[in-house]
């Protein structure tokens, strides 16, 4: 039997969609224009590979990241696009009514795109753990919330703790884990008897998962630097994010093997941990001054993360209803949160250094930076996550969790797709 | 020898228009963040606005957003800002600044090493 | 907001000159100091609140760190007699300067 977009899916989807896409052309129509002044054409393309660089990692790297599931590939990697695209139009315009609205139209520049892509990255971190629960109706709502909670989030740390662009955008890690696990908190949870298939990884989606994780890995240092303002930082940024992600994957793939009784590789522990160095990084890589303490990093968090993905599926699963596969989201808590925990070490010595008996105060800071983050992240994601209950969006029943038969056309309607 | 050079200065009615050029030698301009900072007659130094090393970011003043646009071209070694709907109170002499980074323990200083002599402009009916 | 002072100040061949600049929230270290000579444009002296830039005569040094900082001109020579300017790059992306102190000759 073929299984329908439910009918009523089909009328709200379209429609609500649409209508949203009218509003924001509208929105651009009358609110936005292009920066008129650039002048060196060899300056834009140079600019623009790093935009390119950050559309690579979210289209293709985290949409095939997501693709492991058995029943559930196209939906993965086609609804992050879905997402993506637009997360990206709303971003740009929000940062730009945050930020430079008052002087009246919103400026576009390849900047305004680039902090819109890696808003919009947010919502993908975010979506691995509810993906495969969701429709695209749904979808939209949390893309809408997510990058509005992002946004504000990032505005109101910028004005009451001074961080530049670059910092405030590293708390993308621990804000997105954070709201995609409790968004999934709040949906339904057990999977019903005859589907416990569906959320199990098969080898040709694992292999789809595995290039979003090379395409992911061979562009983090573009993320970790897009929003840095001097070449040296950027440098710095890109070297040590390089060293970092490249001891991750070592530790990944030799910490995966220790921690498995016959000595095999997981997949799943892979496809996250070679990330690891990358996320731990991200908030202090153009302050580490020596590749060796960048590489120490990825070690570590290279153990966190096969140790993460080893012990806290189980608990994610029983509490969270998140797939043992669908390990972003603790994984990038856990390494966001070990990113802080190191930026606030260098801020301790930085504040020792200067002598000025200041050290209490600057780390009450950082730690009042980041709860906000966390708390900002955890009451719009059980927003959303309550906002998603609603019955109006018509949410696949649980029997149709993980299935992509519920959301494409398959021609010859077979199961082993 | 590292040096700046600004022009483009003159005498201009308000709410007219004027572009300032500032050329660059002895360093390589793509290398760094500028930017420029004015100065009015008996006045203080004021900073206008600012454009990162590679163009993609440009920052400006609550006093000129809106009328003024940074910008530059590399590959010229050349630094502008275009000045519009002019009032008297720009009336200022304009220096560029390139911007240096230092790396400190938790954050890059930030500080202008290099400036240029000025160019004047003088917002008059 | 930067405040320097004091806004002009009298001083001797020879004397010790201190200004000051307070900030209207923690900046930590990232202040920078400028000299102005009438007509010239302003000359980077310190960075990073105490940070010595090259080609400065070691006489000007810098110290303070959080909101007040100060600038230091242990033997003041002829040739030091200018305006002088606080500037803040805490503030991203806005940079601030301060009003100005002025060093005259007594």
């Known amino acids: 039997m073929s299984s329908k977009y439910p009918r009523s899916v089909r009328r709200c989807l379209p429609l609500w969609a649409l209508t949203l896409e009218a509003a924001l052309i509208l929105l651009f129509y009358f609110f936005t224009h292009y920066d008129a002044s650039l002048e060196d054409q060899k300056g834009l393309v140079a600019s623009y590979q790093v935009g390119q660089d950050l559309t690579v990692m979210a289209a293709i790297g985290l949409g095939f990241l997501t693709s492991s599931f058995r029943r559930h590939s196209w939906s993965s990697v086609a609804f992050n696009l879905f997402m993506l695209a637009l997360g990206v139009q709303w971003a740009i315009l929000l940062d730009g009514f945050l930020s430079q609205f008052p002087s009246g139209k919103v400026v576009i520049t390849l900047f305004s795109i680039r902090l819109a892509t890696m808003s919009a990255l947010s919502v993908l971190i975010s979506v691995d753990a509810v993906l495969g629960k969701v429709n695209l109706a749904q979808l939209v709502v949390m893309v809408l919330v997510e990058v509005t909670a992002l946004g504000n989030l990032r505005m109101v740390i910028s004005n009451i703790f001074n961080t530049d662009y670059h910092m405030n955008m590293m708390h993308i890690y621990v804000f997105a884990a954070y709201f995609g696990l409790s968004v999934a908190w709040c949906l339904p949870k057990p999977l019903p008897e005859g589907t416990e298939d569906k959320d199990q990884t098969a080898t040709i989606p694992s292999l789809s998962a595995m290039l979003g994780a090379l395409f992911l890995w061979m562009f983090w240092p573009s993320f970790n630097s897009a929003l840095l303002r001097s070449p040296i930082e950027r440098k710095n940024a890109v070297f040590n994010t390089y060293y970092a992600v490249a001891v991750s994957v070592v530790t990944a793939i030799s910490g995966s093997s220790l921690a498995h009784p016959q000595g095999k590789i997981s997949k799943t522990y892979v496809h996250s941990a070679v990330l690891a160095g990358g996320v731990a990084v991200g908030t202090s890589c153009h302050l580490i001054p020596s590749p060796w303490l960048a590489m120490v990093l990825g070690l570590v968090a290279g153990l966190i993360s096969v140790g993460g993905a080893k012990y806290l599926p189980g608990c994610c699963n029983r509490v969270l209803g998140i797939p043992h596969s669908s390990i972003m989201g603790y994984n990038f808590s856990l390494l966001g949160l070990l990113g802080e925990i190191i930026y606030i070490v260098l801020l301790v010595l930085d504040t020792v250094g200067a002598g000025n008996g200041m050290i209490g105060f600057q780390v009450l800071l950082s730690i009042g930076e980041l709860s906000l983050a966390i708390v900002i992240a955890l009451m719009s994601g059980l927003l959303t996550g309550l906002l998603l209950n609603l019955k109006i969006w018509k949410a696949p029943h649980e029997a149709k969790y993980f299935d992509d038969q519920v959301f494409w056309k398959f021609p010859h309607l077979a199961v082993g797709f | 020898q590292v040096k700046l050079l600004e022009s483009g200065g003159g005498v201009v009615q308000p709410g007219r228009s004027l572009r300032l050029s500032c050329i660059a030698s002895?360093?390589?301009?793509?290398?760094?963040?500028m930017h420029w900072v004015r100065q009015a007659p008996g006045k203080g130094l004021e900073w206008v606005a600012g454009?990162?090393?590679?163009?993609?970011?440009?920052n400006y003043a609550d006093s000129v957003k809106g009328r003024f646009t940074i910008s530059r071209d590399n590959s010229k070694n050349t630094l502008y800002l275009q000045l519009n709907s002019l009032r008297d109170e720009d009336t200022a002499v304009y220096y560029c600044?390139?911007?240096?980074?230092?790396?400190?323990?938790?954050?890059?200083?930030?500080?202008?090493?290099?400036w240029g002599k000025g160019t004047t402009v003088t917002v008059s009916p | 907001v930067m405040t320097q002072s004091p806004s002009s100040l009298s001083a001797s061949v020879g004397d010790r000159v201190t200004i000051t600049c307070r900030a209207s929230?923690?900046?930590?270290?990232?202040l920078n100091w400028y000299q102005q000579k009438p007509g010239k444009a302003p000359k980077l002296l310190i960075y990073g609140a105490s940070t010595l830039q090259s080609g400065v005569p070691s006489r000007f040094s810098g110290s303070g760190s959080g909101a007040v900082f100060t600038l230091t001109i242990a033997s003041l020579q002829p040739e030091d007699f200018a305006t002088y300017y606080c500037q803040e790059s805490y503030s991203n992306p806005l940079i601030t300067f301060g009003q100005g102190t002025r060093l005259e000759t007594k």
């Open positions: 600044a390139r911007e240096r980074a230092a790396r400190g323990i938790s954050r890059f200083y930030y500080y202008m090493d290099v």
């Open positions: 929230q923690s900046i930590r270290s990232h």
């Open positions: 454009i990162w090393f590679d163009g993609s970011n440009k």
């Open positions: 002895g360093f390589t301009l793509r290398n760094y963040a």
